[in-house]
């Protein structure tokens, strides 16, 4: 290789070792018989050299720095050339550096031809390996404006007092032009101005100077956004920190065309403006920081440019063509009415008919879109009926109660998914078997999952709510006499992540007379809390419920009731509880309207708890809460 640098070119070429690799064999630059690992070539020098290995690009990098002095003479403005031409350089990873020094009063503008630049944050890299690192100067201090890739929106960067631009090209990249030019401008009276041009819809992520380190004290940085008039821009702050200000206040200022209150001043913690039409400017203003504890000001934000919301073109497909007896409603979630103006929030069918709520029915494929500034203002409620009309056909048949993935993929939170399970009267009953054992929600042990199953009777005349159940408990199955509704209710957006934990199978089984039977297989680790259905309203008249409680061979179960008396007063009939050992059939019967509830009792084998209600007088209802705790057996009593 031969590199010859013209005199007065102010170019220095440096070939040096790159980041060390785990290559076994070292490689050297060979020049007049010497093997060296660093070669520096200055203006006016001509040097011939070779490499001692076949793939020097795995070992060495080359830096070409051109110093441009605009202090002592005229500045060479215009398109910047790659000198020396890349074809004359060894095929190493190359960094071209232009260091422009200018007076404080002179503005310098870097203009980037297409493709424009896209800023990247710490730890990110450019797909093609081509990076632009741009820094400015405040007196003697270097300020990093940012690192940029190709294919973005940044078209111009204006600075004053000097600029350092480093263009990094991988050894295999064919690029032979700098892709930018330098122009002089009048003083910009701030650290820098970054111009970002949107041709159509898109987004740009931008950062304050020195990000993720602190923005220079009491400085001003401006971003100018060029947005077509038919599009709308929204700003959101992805990450920011505030420093400790002694004087002035850190803030962002917007200059929004058509606004009567320009500049509009926002705190960094405020919700930033959205739906802006056309061009706008955003400026970040620092403050005088506390010398003892300055903290740091930094900002990373995103500008999203899209068609106005009434032209929103994001289509969601909801395929209900294979479903039967199902309806899906998207509607506003209840909120306290405020007097403040709230933009409309609509859901549209086929992008044409828009309304504040929409019901989709089974049997077809639906295309929907949203016109809404905040989709958390909406939620979804779904109802599906699974019915059996012919008991001979249905018996032992099973159905999976799961939210279809099409529904989970919608950008609106699911509130309720209800399955109405209908059986022929006095012919069949139902059994619910969860994928994961269930816990009954009680005050003593509330559910803290992102969803629960609400199980209630679906017979219009019957007011029977079996309870709220969530995954992670000891209830292995729930058998119910007749029609019920099972509602999966979500409580947190994290349901999307926990959706895999949902899973309930319903089977049609031979008819039985009790209103409900809970099969409980307690874990040794925790106390199981169980309560009678219709808690707070009381077990309905003449209703009977049972719990089948399994006790492992090596354990003993402690059954504890949480009050002394049941509190029920019977108008007609008797209320009673039977505790029956399953192995010996031995049973204890307690009159709930007369007797004291049993003290904690120990059971070495599986047992039943059956509670049957009378017709109570109003206000004296039957509500019972009890717990089962397993402990290891100390003495074998068998």
């Amino acid at each position: 290789f031969e590199i010859a640098l013209p005199r007065e070119s102010n170019i220095t070429v440096l070939i040096k070792l790159g980041t060390p690799t785990l290559l076994a064999k070292p490689c050297y630059i060979v020049i007049s018989k010497r093997h060296i690992t660093m070669l520096s070539i200055k203006s006016g020098e001509r040097i011939v050299f070779t490499f001692s290995c076949q793939s020097p690009e795995n070992h060495f990098v080359i830096e070409i720095q051109k110093n441009i002095d605009c202090m002592s003479g005229p500045c060479p403005f215009g398109e910047v050339q790659l000198q020396p031409s890349t074809s004359l350089l060894p095929t190493l990873n190359r960094t071209f550096i232009w260091d422009v020094k200018a007076h404080k009063s002179i503005g310098l503008e870097l203009q980037f031809s297409i493709p424009r630049l896209r800023q990247i944050g710490p730890g990110e890299s450019c797909p093609d390996g081509v990076t632009h690192s741009i820094s400015g100067r405040i007196d003697a201090t270097v300020v990093r404006i940012g690192t940029f890739c190709s294919n973005g929106t940044v078209s111009r960067i204006k600075m004053q007092e000097g600029v350092k631009m480093a263009l990094h090209l991988p050894w295999f990249h064919p690029r032979n032009v700098s892709g930018f030019s330098i122009a002089n401008r009048s003083s910009i009276k701030r650290l820098c101005i970054i111009e970002s041009v949107f041709e159509g819809e898109g987004s740009a992520t931008l950062m304050s100077a020195n990000y993720p380190e602190g923005f220079p004290e009491d400085e001003l940085m401006t971003w100018q956004f060029v947005v077509p008039a038919h599009l709308r821009a929204s700003v959101s702050f992805l990450n920011f920190n505030l420093s400790n200000c002694e004087r002035k206040e850190e803030r962002v200022e917007y200059y929004i065309p058509g606004s009567t209150t320009n500049p509009e001043v926002f705190k960094l913690e405020d919700k930033q403006p959205g739906n802006m039409a056309g061009n706008f400017n955003l400026s970040l203003q620092g403050c005088d920081q506390d010398a003892q504890s300055p903290g740091i000001l930094r900002l990373q934000f995103q500008v999203l440019v899209q068609h106005p919301q009434n032209e929103s073109n994001k289509i969601y497909v909801v395929d209900l063509s294979n479903e039967r007896a199902m309806s899906l409603t998207i509607e506003p979630r209840p909120v306290k009415q405020s007097r403040k103006f709230v933009p409309g929030c609509f859901v549209c069918l086929e992008s044409r008919t828009c309304s504040s709520n929409l019901t989709l029915t089974s049997g077809s494929k639906h295309k929907i879109s949203f016109l809404c500034d905040d989709l958390t203002r909406l939620w979804m409620n779904v109802e599906k009926t699974i019915s059996c009309t012919d008991h001979r056909y249905c018996q032992r048949k099973s159905y999976s109660l799961q939210v279809p993935s099409d529904i989970l993929h919608l950008p609106v939170e699911l509130h309720d998914f209800s399955w109405k399970l209908l059986v022929p009267k006095d012919r069949l009953s139902l059994v619910l078997v969860p994928a994961q054992k269930l816990q009954q929600h009680t005050h003593e042990k509330p559910c803290n999952t992102s969803f629960s199953y609400l199980v209630a009777s679906a017979i219009p005349s019957q007011d029977l709510y079996f309870g709220s159940f969530c995954p992670g408990g000891s209830i292995k199955q729930i058998q119910v006499k007749q029609n019920i509704s099972v509602t999966l209710r979500t409580f947190a957006p994290s349901f999307q992540q926990e959706a895999s934990r949902q899973g309930l199978t319903v089977s049609f089984i031979p008819y039985f007379k009790e209103e409900g039977v809970f099969t409980v297989t307690p874990d040794t680790k925790s106390k199981v809390y169980l309560r009678t259905p219709n808690w707070d309203r009381g077990l309905p008249s003449l209703t009977s419920v049972s719990w089948n409680i399994s006790v492992p061979r090596d354990q003993v179960a402690c059954l504890t009731f949480f009050k002394e008396r049941s509190g029920v007063v019977c108008q007609t009939g008797r209320a009673f509880m039977i505790i029956q050992e399953q192995r010996t059939r031995a049973e204890e019967i307690f009159s709930l309207d007369e007797d004291v509830l049993p003290k904690p009792s120990f059971h070495h084998h599986s047992f039943w708890v059956n509670i049957s209600n009378c017709s109570p007088t109003s206000g004296k209802q039957l509500d019972l809460l009890f717990s089962v705790t397993l402990t290891p057996r100390t003495v074998d009593l068998t």
């Epitope: 440096l14 018989k33 010497r34 060296i36 070669l39 070539i41 040097i47």
Partner: antibody
């Protein structure tokens, strides 16, 4: 492990020819960049570089002695040789051979062989 | 030819103090961003031993008490702190240009 060992006659009379051999191990003179130099140190004086031979058989000599010096190598037997013609008493010194792995500094030296020129 | 002048010719330094040896070249020994100046230590009856290569690089196995600095024509070898075992003669050597030359040597005594 790199080792160099010089050998020579020990005593010569003026006008005779000095033949020195440097036998080495732990490296090869066919490796790119590798070279061996001869350096001497007269008693009570400083070090003086005499000659160098590179891996590609290129040779360099100290101009003040060039007409009397010949350096050569036998790559296969890992040896470098130096001949100095017409020795006189000023050539009395300890002669060292030293390895130069990258064409400049000497990282390994032999223990040296002493030459006395006396009539 | 490039003449290397070492100073002082000899110096005596107390244990655990700093010793500084200078080497001045009659012309620059720098080429292509490298300084082709090296330092050796020689004890009586032993061959020289490489301490520092290319002005400032410490040869492996040499204690970090030894350091080198300088460029173009002025170079310095520093030993800090000096230990009893450092009593020896120190030579600078250049090979930026033929003929390769050594300095006259600096004899270090430990007080």
């Amino acid at each position: 492990e790199v080792q160099l060992q010089e050998s020579g006659p020990g005593i010569l009379q003026p006008s005779q020819t000095l033949s020195l051999t440097c036998s080495f191990s732990g490296f090869s003179l066919s490796t790119s960049g590798m070279g061996v130099s001869w350096i001497r140190k007269p008693s009570g004086k400083g070090l003086e570089w005499l000659a160098h031979i590179f891996w590609d058989d290129d040779k360099r000599y100290n101009p003040s002695l060039k007409s009397r010096l010949t350096i050569s190598k036998d790559t296969s037997s890992n040896q470098v040789f130096l001949m100095i013609t017409s020795v006189d008493t000023a050539d009395t010194a300890t002669y060292y051979c030293a390895r130069s792995p990258y064409g400049d500094y000497f990282d390994y030296w032999g223990q040296g062989t002493t030459l006395t020129v006396s009539s | 030819k490039i003449v290397l002048t070492q100073s002082p010719a000899s110096l005596a330094v107390s244990l655990r103090q700093r010793a500084t040896i200078s080497c001045r070249a009659s012309e620059s020994v720098d080429s292509y961003g490298n300084s082709f100046m090296h330092w050796y230590q020689q004890k009586p009856g032993q061959p020289p031993k490489l301490l520092i290569y290319r002005a400032s690089n410490l040869e492996s196995g040499v204690p970090a008490r030894f350091s080198g600095s300088g460029s173009r024509t002025d170079f310095t070898l520093t030993i800090d702190p000096v230990e009893a075992d450092d009593a020896a003669t120190y030579y600078c050597q250049q090979n930026n240009e033929d003929p390769w030359t050594f300095g006259g040597g600096t004899k270090l005594e430990i007080k």
